[in-house]
């Protein structure tokens, strides 16, 4: 369960990929869509507001009954869209949507490599957003691989302002 | 109970070898960050090498790097740093430690170990 | 790398009074800062995580606030077992930094 409905903290960001490639959302047909793409050097990146909750581990899962503790994020590009995950289309899309938000809006956060991060799906243990085709999908992650694969992580730049509502 | 306790410390020449272990209880060690941090006898705090959870990725800081290795054994919830080539300056307190957060080091470490000293000297 | 920059270095105060302890990171972190408390011999105890977040079973009188790069240790009322040195450090990014510790002493 998620500790509480207020975040913790909240912070300004863009999001990249490892390689460096941009995460940008731009309205089409009155959704928006999500692209992986090279910026060119004078277009400003997209922000994102993530939204840090935390939450209790199921003890069967962790080992460690009430002691641990998840860090869970929700990624809002545009005021009242959230990233979310569609478990069945294996895909991650852009949603209007009134708080609370549903559980397929939150994602695990990972520090998987050394100051890159990873969201794996709250609604979906072993699956993450990942890099696919120049879009974001869903990707299923053995854990019996060494998890460094580098289509699941991401960097995140924060952008020093103090608003948190955005575009 | 969530326990964290160090082992192998001691007195050891300059070019010398020691592994530290870091036997935990009480959680799986493979779903946190683990940390190594030292601290020289009245001084502050120094971070050492840190190991990523479930990926195993592994951290050090420069003035240790290729000649430390931490690693661990998920079979013996136990993690390990293997000191080598010790120097002089290597003399701390050697703490291990563990995140908040399953997964993440965003929120710092919140259980520790009690520390093993490490002397090396001739 | 990040530097933490923390002051002061040590600080003769009584019981009762009100501590306030500051750092500056180098560059900006959000809100990903830890503050610590350590008596000698002993390790580290987490008290506050996340800037502002109290650790579980720490006395409410700690409070923690800042983001970006200037963050601050409030402690409202000491009492006689916070005597101690208390270091900050950043958890935003690798090496995660230590400031170089506040030393509260009796006066």
């Known amino acids: 369960s998620i500790t509480g409905i207020s975040p913790i903290t909240e912070s300004l960001a863009s999001l990249s990929t490892y390689n460096d490639q941009s995460i940008t959302f731009a309205l089409e047909d009155e959704s928006y869509e999500i692209y992986v793409e090279d910026l060119k050097k004078d277009k400003k990146k997209d922000k994102v507001l993530l939204s840090y909750y935390e939450s209790q581990h199921p003890s069967s899962e962790s080992g460690d009954g009430v002691d641990g503790k998840m860090l869970m994020v929700t990624l809002s590009p545009t005021k009242d869209f959230w990233l979310q995950a569609n478990n069945k289309e294996h895909s991650v899309e852009l949603h209007k949507c009134e708080k609370p938000l549903p559980d397929q809006a939150f994602f695990v956060l990972h520090n998987r490599s050394f100051n890159c991060v990873s969201f794996e799906c709250k609604t979906d243990p072993g699956v993450f957003i990942g890099v696919k085709d120049n879009h974001l999908a869903l990707i299923k992650v053995d854990y019996s691989e060494n998890l460094g694969s580098e289509n699941i992580l991401f960097k995140l730049s924060e952008i020093l302002e103090h608003h948190h509502h955005h575009h | 109970e969530v326990q964290l306790v160090e082992s192998g410390g001691g007195l050891v020449q300059p070019g010398g070898s020691l592994r530290l272990s870091c036997a935990a209880s009480g959680f799986t060690l493979r779903s946190y960050f683990m940390t190594w941090v030292r601290q020289v006898p009245g001084k502050g705090l120094e971070g050492v090498s840190a190991?990523?959870?479930?990926?195993?990725?592994?951290y050090y800081t420069d003035s240790v790097k290729g000649r430390f290795t931490i690693s661990r054994d998920n079979s013996k919830n136990t993690l390990f740093l293997q000191m080598n080539s010790l120097r002089a300056e290597d003399t701390a307190v050697y703490f291990c430690?563990?995140?908040?957060?399953?997964?993440?080091?965003?929120?710092?470490?919140?259980?520790w170990g009690q520390g093993t000293l490490v002397t090396v000297s001739s | 790398d990040i530097q933490m920059t923390q002051s002061p270095s040590s600080v003769s105060v009584s019981v009762g009074d009100r501590v306030t302890i500051t750092c500056r990171a180098s560059?900006?972190?959000?809100?990903?800062l830890a503050w610590y408390q350590q008596k000698p011999g002993k390790a580290p105890k987490l008290l506050i995580y996340?800037?502002?977040s109290l650790q579980s079973g720490v006395p409410s009188r700690f409070s923690g606030s800042g983001s970006g790069t200037d963050f601050t240790l409030t402690i409202s009322s000491l009492q006689p077992e916070d005597f101690a040195t208390y270091y900050c450090q950043q958890t935003n990014s690798f090496p995660l930094t230590f400031g170089g510790g506040t030393k509260v002493e009796i006066k």
């Open positions: 560059q900006g972190i959000s809100s990903w």
């Open positions: 430690a563990r995140t908040v957060y399953s997964s993440s080091y965003y929120g710092g470490f919140q259980h």
């Open positions: 996340v800037a502002s």
């Open positions: 190991i990523s959870g479930i990926s195993g990725g592994t």
